[in-house]
């Protein structure tokens, strides 16, 4: 999906008001310095591409993020404010159905959510030069 035509300001507002709080809740008890940010993005469409991938695609050691509250709200924001987004997902999500039960938080998942927080922060500051 090409995120170029999304309403970035509305997605940003939803993130700041709600999604960010759910990410913090997920990370509660974890020091903010515990994980290094290794995933980056260069502009808002790219950031949303990376956010979608990290949120909804199972990775080794962390298959369950897509069933978390912040993921549901992320999906809602993308579907509402990115034209045509909801039509692009059929096969991808259905294929993962069986593997996506909510379960105990692993260290790998905490690391992945820490990366997500970094991507969202970058999404919110699109005019900053890439480091």
């Amino acid at each position: 999906y090409d995120f170029t035509n999304c309403d970035f300001e509305k997605i940003k507002a939803a993130y700041l008001s709600t999604i960010s709080k759910d990410l913090i809740t997920y990370m509660s008890g974890t020091k903010s310095t515990e994980f290094n940010n290794t995933v980056s993005c260069s502009n808002r469409p790219h950031c949303l591409t990376e956010i979608q991938s990290l949120t909804f695609n199972p990775t080794a050691g962390c298959a369950s993020l897509a069933k978390e509250m912040f993921a549901m709200k992320t999906k809602a924001a993308l579907a509402i404010w990115c034209p045509g987004y909801s039509e692009t997902q059929i096969n991808a999500t259905q294929a993962m159905k069986k593997r996506r039960k909510r379960k105990v938080t692993t260290n790998k998942c905490l690391e992945q959510v820490s990366q997500l927080q970094g991507l969202w922060r970058r999404f919110n500051r699109p005019l900053l030069k890439q480091q």
């Epitope: 897509a66 549901m72 579907a79 509402i80």
Partner: antibody, heavy 121, light 108 residues
Framework: QVQLVQSGAEVKKPGSSVKVSCKAS????????VNWVRQAPGQGLEWIGQ????????DYAQKFQGRATLTADKSTSTAYMELSSLRSEDTAVYFC??????????????WGQGTTVTVSS | EIVLTQSPDFQSVTPKEKVTITCSVS???????LHWYQQKPDQSPKPWIY???NLASGVPSRFSGSGSGTDYTLTINSLEAEDAATYYC?????????FGQGTKLEIK
């Protein structure tokens, strides 16, 4: 304008199933989660689960896992809630409600009018 | 599961009186995830307050909401007859989504 119109009242026997429909209009059906909530007579509100019509993704309250099935038909913009192995305690009004961002806060905005399901032998 | 406990369950109030309904949450949640609904007999619930303190469209300004962590409040500054209803708090912080048991306001 956004509307959620639910199917009519049902009377069912214990052990049977019921399927309640919720027809959406006035918005892009596939882009919004649909929640299902029930209310037993004189009681409070109880969340059953939600479905995202875009890809059929679902979440259920543990209590209803395995007994409730949420589906959505994008071609008719209709969400369905099927409840099996009915018992008298399932007698309730069943509501569908659209999940959305309201002033950047996520919650439900539009609700269906409710469908009364009576389970009686 | 997060449990929401409202107080009182029932209140009989005279018009123009100030009313306070509390919602106690079993574990701390973000204020952005606490909402209030109003329901009148034989009607669907209506969104009333989003994110602890933001009034839904059409809700009179005599209503307000506040709170954080585990303690939330809905306040009606000067009760009017049309406010007779049951009010529910709800959390959107974690699954399953849960509601308070409701507070029924009756006009004396």
């Amino acid at each position: 304008q956004v509307q959620l119109v639910q199917s009519g009242a049902e009377v069912k026997k214990p052990g049977s199933s019921v399927k309640v429909s919720c027809k959406a209009s006035g918005y892009t059906f596939s882009s919004y989660w649909v929640n299902w909530v029930r209310q037993a007579p004189g009681q409070g509100l109880e969340w059953i689960g939600q479905i995202y019509p875009g890809d059929g993704d679902t979440d259920y309250a543990q209590k209803f896992q395995g007994r409730a099935t949420l589906t959505a038909d994008k071609s008719t913009s209709t969400a369905y809630m099927e409840l099996s192995s009915l018992r008298s305690e399932d007698t309730a009004v069943y509501f569908c409600a659209r999940g959305t961002y309201y002033n950047n806060y996520y919650g439900t905005d539009y609700w269906g009018q409710g469908t009364t399901v009576t389970v009686s032998s | 599961e997060i449990v929401l406990t409202q107080s009182p369950d029932f209140q009989s109030v005279t018009p123009k009186e100030k009313v306070t309904i509390t919602c106690s949450v079993s574990s701390s949640i973000s204020s952005s995830n606490l909402h209030w609904y109003q329901q009148k007999p034989d009607q669907s619930p209506k969104p009333w307050i989003y994110g602890t303190s933001n009034l839904a469209s059409g809700v009179p300004s005599r209503f307000s909401g506040s709170g954080s962590g585990t303690d939330y409040t809905l306040t009606i500054n000067s009760l009017e007859a049309e406010d007779a209803a049951t009010y529910y708090c709800q959390q959107w912080s974690s699954y399953p989504l849960t509601f308070g048991q409701g507070t029924k306001l009756e006009i004396k």
